[in-house]
Amino acid sequence: GELETSDVVTVVLGQDAKLPCFYRGDSGEQVGQVAWARVDAGEGAQELALLHSKYGLHVSPAYEGRVEQPPPPRNPLDGSVLLRNAVQADEGEYECRVSTFPAGSFQARLRLRVLVPPLPSLNPGPALEEGQGLTLAASCTAEGSPAPSVTWDTEVKGTTSSRSFKHSRSAAVTSEFHLVPSRSMNGQPLTCVVSHPGLLQDQRITHILHVSFLAEASVRGLEDQNLWHIGREGAMLKCLSEGQPPPSYNWTRLDGPLPSGVRVDGDTLGFPPLTTEHSGIYVCHVSNEFSSRDSQVTVDVLDPQEDSGKQVDLVSAS
């Protein structure tokens, strides 16, 4: 007769491992007992369990409650056992020793491999600001056994670097994603992808990029010079900019206080019916936590009674 087993049994942490040992004997042969032992190099043999044809299943106190026979129906020549709730410390070499009648004793070894799926974590880097050089956007770490694979999935252009730390029964892999921040990256997803034989599918953690910036400011509303005349209603100036975080707006008049009746509504400056006292230099001040910008315009309210043309100057400053 001969023993049938596997060279390697692979199981995911927490699952049950079936350790196969089947005696394929000749007609009339009987299996008296099957002894299972842990036989890691240099540590000697530690009995795990013994299946006896008359006395039944014996389990070592060290494995109490964790070793069972497979559910019935059972073949009397099958010495396989189930190791419940596999833990990392179970990984190693096991020996199955079968005592038969009348053929004698047979033995075989297998290796139990316990896969420890990783629990990845993603850590964003320092705040990203437009104008910085190559900057850490995020790092992703995953620890498992065997070592997991950590990659990135993104439309953003950048560079990656990985490092690995080996522990006694596992390995931790950290991958970093570096980029040169630009405003076009704002809101773009950066996804860490972790692959591992113990995972049914890749694990993905997504980080949304936030790049601080502030665009140049400009003022709209003076495009048609002829509209700015005495008595006109609904005249307004609008300050244009964009930024991350969203900027706040403030209006001032360079050559004095804002005229009475002029209404400030965020980025918009609303005028009452125009008079000559609304003529002047207006400044839009845009700011966020990253930066600030100014844009100023000169308003010249025309008197329709006069033939002189309206003069408008646009000046932008940072």
Partner: nanobody, 122 residues
Amino acid sequence: QVQLVESGGGLVQPGGSLRLSCAASGSIFSINVMGWYRQAPGKQRELVATITSGGSVNYADSVKGRFTISRDNANNTVYLQMNTLKPEDTAVYYCTADQLGPLGLLSPTIYWGQGTLVTVSS
């Protein structure tokens, strides 16, 4: 041949404890599994607990948590510590053993002791 001699039986009140011992002698070079069976009056012999030379154990459901089997391989002795005894534990307790022969051949012979009486009664 293997000779098995039990000791430690007697009368005990319900809830009490007893410790049985069984010493093996004779051709004991390859004693494999040792243990205890019991037979109550008018009933079939039933397995109580057995232990391998490597220390793996097997208990009947009816005694789990109350009885503990242990073994001294150096002296070829097996013990059965019986706690929280019940009247239904009353029986003759038999020591049992089998042997691994040359080449790991499991002997079809199981050896038995003469038995020791345990009576649980108030």
